[in-house]
Interface confidence: medium
């Protein structure tokens, strides 16, 4: 493998917890500018497993507002526009990294945290358990 | 909005870029322990809009490897197990925060970055454009 030399311009850390505590620049760089701007914004209504979006706010967290998907039905919408309970609407979940103020209310000290959010829903064939 | 008093025990910051550059504890806290442990891990195969996972690696990013969902078909799987092209499989995308080493190769200095990832796929009714 390539041996990466340590950059001589790196910040020095004399923190006894190093490298648990590091400096992070919050001037967020967005790498999405070249991606397809067509986002999944209307899929929640057009999906065969439609979902609603619920606002989750926490001022001690960055990002403070997270929108969570909740599937509208247990089943999926069929060609007639009715709910088919032989199929299941299930949330697609994703872990995301967030920053939590620690100690609370501190503007410049955070802890990385993993939280699980539901991004949308998909329609799946159910797992049927046959009883002998 | 509510004014949150500054905690007197906060670390002091004399950084001229404050509060752009902050201290972050990397001992990642997992808030998911009390959530339903049922993971969406097998949905990629059971969905009517199934997807495959593709590897994207960047050693200067955390997490370094991101597996992206790519829908297997343009259409959706119908009750007979065939692809129905009257419906569309579409990716559900979500922005996530990642950490990038900055300057490069520094083990204790990072920048937050937002990237768009495809988490899974859902089946939607197509938008039909009628030509007059």
């Amino acid at each position: 493998g390539i041996t990466i030399p340590r950059n001589p311009g790196c910040p020095n850390s004399e923190d006894k917890n190093f490298p648990r505590t590091v400096m992070v620049n919050l001037n967020i760089h967005n790498r999405n500018t070249n991606t397809n701007p067509k986002r999944s914004s209307d899929y929640y209504n057009r999906s065969t497993s439609p979902w609603n979006l619920h606002r989750n706010e926490d001022p001690e967290r960055y990002p403070s507002v997270i929108w969570e998907a909740k599937c509208r039905h247990l089943g999926c919408i069929n060609a007639d526009g009715n709910v088919d309970y032989h199929m299941n609407s299930v949330p697609i979940q994703q872990e995301i990294l967030v920053l939590r103020r620690e100690p609370p209310h501190c503007p410049n000290s955070f802890r990385l945290e993993k939280i699980l959010v539901s991004v949308g829903c998909t329609c799946v064939t159910p797992i049927v358990h046959h009883v002998a | 909005g509510i004014t949150i008093p500054r905690n007197p025990g906060c670390p002091n910051s004399e950084d001229k870029n404050f509060p752009r550059t902050v201290m972050v504890n990397l001992n990642i806290h997992n808030r998911n322990t009390n959530t339903n442990p049922k993971r969406s891990s097998d949905y990629y195969n059971r969905s009517t809009s199934p997807w495959n996972l593709h590897r994207n690696e960047d050693p200067e990013r955390y997490p370094s490897v991101i597996w992206e969902a790519k829908c297997r078909h343009l259409g959706c799987i119908n009750a007979d197990g065939n692809v129905d092209y009257h419906m569309n499989s579409v990716p559900i995308q979500q922005e996530i925060l990642v950490l990038r080493r900055e300057p490069p190769h520094c083990p204790n200095s990072f920048r937050l970055e937002k990237i768009l990832v495809s988490v899974g796929c859902t089946c939607v009714t197509p938008i039909v454009h009628h030509v007059a």
């Epitope: 493998g1 | 001992n27 442990p37 991101i66 996530i96």
Partner: antibody, heavy 126, light 107 residues
């Protein structure tokens, strides 16, 4: 080709310490962590702890907490495991294993061990 | 910690036969279950990751299934070179834990 090459066999006295190295090549060192797993003679596999090379952060199994120290040197792409207070129960083959830091199917996963070192035999005997 | 229990402990099989090894977790681990093969005097080798994904270069006769608490490793058409000990491993919760191993012998 990914390779993990470990240091040679060690014979140690009870109460002493041992430090084993694991030199990684092929692939980017920061794209994975290194875990240490041991196997006593005729026994199964036991995870001791690991390090995430990207941050240098470590996790240890409670059984070894306070006795094991895992470090990594990014400049030489080498990980180290030091075990102190050795007893005869620590006689085992010690393996380093590569653990990718991945965002898998929607999760920040702790992972499979996709490549393993050849093993280092440590014998503790008076 | 999560306890993984494999069965059987030992299996003696004729070449070309199908081998099934099960691994049961003491609690739900989603799909974070991996399978390794270890031949005598060698390091373990990853066969299956995340319950059902084959590691690169692993013969197609090896497959994995299951989620939650019950998992299966299947060898469809055992070959002589498949003799060894098979371990399951969970990475859902720290500490990582392994099953006690299943030794597969050739008749």
């Amino acid at each position: 080709e990914v390779q993990l090459v470990q240091s040679g066999a060690e014979v140690k006295k009870p109460g002493s310490s041992v430090k084993i190295s694991c030199k990684a090549s092929g692939g980017s060192f920061t794209s994975y962590g290194i875990s240490w797993v041991r196997q006593a003679p005729g026994q199964g596999l036991e995870w001791m702890g690991g390090i995430t090379n990207f941050f240098g952060s470590t996790d240890y199994a409670q059984k070894f907490q306070g006795r094991v120290t895992i470090t990594a040197d990014e400049s030489t792409t080498t990980a180290y495991m030091e075990l102190s207070g050795l007893t005869s129960d620590d006689t085992a083959v010690y393996y380093c294993a590569r653990e990718p830091n991945e965002f898998w199917n929607g999760y920040f996963a702790t992972n499979d061990f996709d490549y393993w070192g050849q093993g280092t035999t440590v014998t503790v005997s008076s | 910690e999560i306890v993984l229990t494999q069965s059987p402990d030992f299996q003696s099989v004729t070449p070309k036969e199908k081998v099934t090894i099960t691994c049961r977790a003491s609690q739900n681990i989603g799909s974070e279950l991996h399978w390794y093969q270890q031949k005598p005097g060698q390091s373990p080798k990853l066969l299956i990751k995340y319950a059902s994904y084959s590691s690169s270069g692993v013969p197609s006769r090896f497959s994995g299934s299951g989620s939650g608490t019950d998992f299966t490793l299947t060898i469809n058409g055992l070959e002589a070179e498949d003799a060894g000990t098979y371990y399951c491993h969970q990475s859902s919760c720290l500490p990582h834990t392994f099953g006690q191993g299943t030794k597969v012998g050739i008749k």
